[in-house]
């Protein structure tokens, strides 16, 4: 095999694969959780039926210094068509309840699994 220099860019990721990879990462987080996730940090709860990818990112991006969710943050940034920065709450129209990151991840995981089962890859 000849190396043509640099890294071959990975092929296009179908939405179904992208969603499955996010689910796998969230499963990984919940299964490997020993101590309280992100030291028990609290994040805004989101409406999982309203533009959830950007909303989830807007909520989680405010957690810093938590390596356990960095990959999730990175993946969600690719699931949102606009750039999200810490402190930005454009998609989070209602901010009234804070929950622990661990609970947020569990809720998001359950919802994404449901979408995947139903074939909703959009």
């Amino acid at each position: 095999l000849t190396c043509l220099g640099g890294f071959a860019s990975p092929g296009p990721v179908p939405p179904s694969t992208a969603l499955r990879e996010l689910i796998e990462e969230l499963v990984n987080i919940t299964q490997n959780q020993k101590a309280p996730l992100c030291n028990g940090s609290m994040v805004w709860s989101i409406n999982l039926t309203a533009g959830m990818y950007c909303a989830a990112l807007e909520s989680l991006i405010n957690v810093s210094g938590c390596s356990a969710i960095e990959k999730t943050q990175r993946m969600l940034s690719g699931f949102c068509p606009h750039k999200v920065s810490a402190g930005q709450f454009s998609s989070l129209h209602v901010r009234d309840t804070k929950i622990e990151v661990a609970q947020f991840v569990k809720d998001l995981l359950l919802h994404l699994k449901k979408l995947f089962r139903e074939g909703q890859f959009n």
Epitope: L19, P81, H82, K83, S90, S91, Q120, F121, N122
Partner: antibody, heavy 118, light 109 residues
């Protein structure tokens, strides 16, 4: 005032590559995703991809994954689109556009016409 | 690959209300498709009108509104004006990429 200034028209040979630029003024590109869209003559729009200029992270439409390469230079506030292995069907006007929650596809460059012909 | 379908032509009169729709071949359009509407006027003048299903871009007149109607995204022009004559493209987000519809030509007679 927000403006996106794109490079001039290009006439290129089949099989060649072309590098298009989009220089922003009135805002810092690292604060936004920059999207690229094409329009073939008298046809609709096709989304090519987007880049986060801050870290270079990209997403591409499946059909352009092996054809388009998006890059950005934050020091010159410029986004780039390289299109490779050009064929006659790649003749189109290519647009850069700024996208954010409050202004989705709100600002567009003037477009760059790329003509692929022998 | 999903296909996004729009009406090809719609005709309305000044002051009337017209609704354009955007259908996804993969099923119901949801808020996670972040439906966008872009207006094209002659000489390739593009304006983003709506993003995130119903978020009107700054400076866009209030007569333009976005929503979900049934299983489709919709753009409603309430009280159409002659200057609204244009081609309107919808774009739907599929987790990691946009797909544009083929556009609806709106004529205001």
């Amino acid at each position: 005032e927000v403006q996106l200034q794109q490079s001039g028209a290009e006439l290129v040979l089949p099989g060649a590559s072309v590098l298009l630029s989009c220089t922003a003024s009135g805002f810092n590109i690292k604060d936004y995703y920059m999207h690229w869209v094409l329009q073939r003559t008298e046809q609709g729009l096709e989304w090519i991809g987007r880049i986060d200029p801050e870290d270079g992270e990209t997403k591409y439409a499946p059909k352009f994954h092996d054809k388009a390469t998006l890059t950005a230079d934050t020091s010159s506030n410029t986004a780039y689109l390289q299109f490779s292995s050009l064929a006659s069907e790649d003749t189109a006007v290519y647009y850069c556009t700024r996208y954010d929650y409050y202004g989705p596809f709100a600002y567009w460059g003037q477009g760059t016409l790329v003509t692929v012909s022998a | 690959q999903a296909v996004v379908t729009q009406e090809s032509v719609l005709t309305t009169s000044p002051g009337e209300t017209v609704t354009l729709t955007c259908r996804s071949s993969t099923g119901a359009v949801t808020t996670s498709n972040y439906a966008n509407w872009v207006q094209e006027k002659p000489d390739h003048l593009f304006t983003g009108l709506i993003g995130g299903t119903n978020n009107r871009a700054p400076g866009v007149p209030a007569r333009f509104s976005g929503s979900l109607i049934g299983d489709k995204a919709a753009l409603t022009i309430t009280g159409a004006q002659t200057e609204d004559e244009a081609i309107y493209f919808c774009a739907l987000w599929y987790i990691n990429h946009f797909i544009f519809g083929s556009g609806t030509k709106v004529t205001v007679l």
